[in-house]
Interface confidence: low
Amino acid sequence: LIIGFGISGRHSITVTTVASAGNIGEDGILSCTFEPDIKLSDIVIQWLKEGVLGLVHEFKEGKDELSEQDEMFRGRTAVFADQVIVGNASLRLKNVQLTDAGTYKCYIITSKGKGNANLEYKTGAFSMPEVNVDYNASSETLRCEAPRWFPQPTVVWASQVDQGANFSEVSNTSFELNSENVTMKVVSVLYNVTINNTYSCMIENDIAKATGDIKVTESEIKRRSHLQLLNSKAS
């Protein structure tokens, strides 16, 4: 969490941002809140990006003002216009690109004063893993597949019964480049699995951590999936 205060003495307002991550090709949110004003027409929101000449987005007098918007963000940004009045200046970014990563500034002007806060935005790819039992092998194996990751993640297997065990010798992980030549499909196979045990396939890079759990008994499968974005710090 980053909390920024106004620049000009007593006419300062609190602006809060949260560091976040964007999934390439999907929509992302750059989070920013501020002390609300009672009049929408008195609120100006400017989003800037370090190293980019034009504005990322500008909202003033109750509507978008995009004449100074940088080309790289053309047609890809929007604020939640109906929530500005309650102090939400978050920016929706469509079709996140790798190049969208960087330091952003949320700059706010209201009748109470000015304020700004920086936000670190990471971009990459992350997806939920799917864990299946593979009966095609000579011994029972588990196959963990996740369609989109970037940068290349690490894959670690764990087991509820053999806690702390190292499965690197009995697993094999491969990375296959997807058609857009950036993200990769992750496939990891775990051999010699035992029945009535819960196994976890954990995929992690510096942006996200995803876990797929599977428990196989004689009569059924139970699964659980979890995806967590890393480094979501507020400022």
Epitope: M128, P129, E130, N132, Y135, I221, R224, S225
Partner: antibody, heavy 118, light 107 residues
């Protein structure tokens, strides 16, 4: 080429039983579970159960326990589903389907067997 | 049981249009979701598995997205041969369930 060839349409009387077959070819029969689905006319699909061709182990949807019995004949690479105590509610198209992996999506389906109870 | 709610129940579109079908799971199913196409009088065919992965031989105009409880199937540049009923299916647990289906017709 993977194929699942099901037996032909059946017209049976209420209270009777019927046994539908699904002959697998183009892959090693014992390498994949076989699943069975029901599709009533104009309706969606329901999972009936699955069978492990290696040991005959089965799992059933609670709704079909006592109604359906799944078996296999490894020597002929054929899976069977017997439906008993038939009523008009059992009139439907029945499919066998092979999953991508156990407990996965179904990448191969039989052509379906139409059962009419009348 | 996990309930799968599909919408719309039916839709009509013209050749070349983009259509989107949505599917909602009654609980979090991660990416354990598949989409099937079923043409009149035929058996279902797998289009998408793991929510986003295209099955072998499926044209690239089909795409799947979503995870957790909200999923969608998108068909870009609709072709006449896409007229069919579409079903979503979860396989998060042993008892798999299907959506009620979406009937896609040509205008």
């Amino acid at each position: 080429e993977v194929q699942l060839q099901q037996s032909g349409p059946e017209l049976v009387k209420p209270g009777a039983s019927v046994k539908i077959s699904c002959k697998a070819s183009g892959y090693t029969f014992t390498d994949y579970y076989m699943n069975w689905m029901k599709q009533s006319h104009g309706k969606s699909l329901e999972w009936i159960g699955d069978i492990n061709p290696n040991n005959g182990g089965t799992s059933y949807n609670q709704k079909f326990k006592g109604k359906a019995t799944l078996t296999v004949d490894k020597s002929s690479s054929t899976a069977y589903m017997e439906l008993r105590s038939l009523t008009s509610e059992d009139s439907a198209v029945y499919y066998c389907a092979r999953p991508y992996y156990y407990g996965s999506s179904y990448d191969y389906w039989g052509q379906g067997t139409t059962l009419t109870v009348s | 049981d996990i309930q799968m709610t599909q919408s719309p129940a039916s839709l009509s579109a013209s050749v070349g249009e983009t259509v989107t079908i949505t599917c909602r799971a009654s609980e979090n199913i991660g990416s354990y979701l598949a989409w099937y196409q079923q043409k009149q009088g035929k058996s279902p065919q797998l289009l998408v598995y793991a929510a986003t992965l295209l099955a072998d031989g499926v044209p690239s105009r089909f795409s799947g997205s979503g995870s957790g409880t909200q999923f969608s199937l998108k068909i870009n540049s609709l072709q006449s041969e896409d007229v069919a009923r579409y079903y979503c299916q979860h396989y998060y647990s042993t008892l798999v369930t299907f959506g009620a289906g979406t009937k896609l017709e040509l205008k």
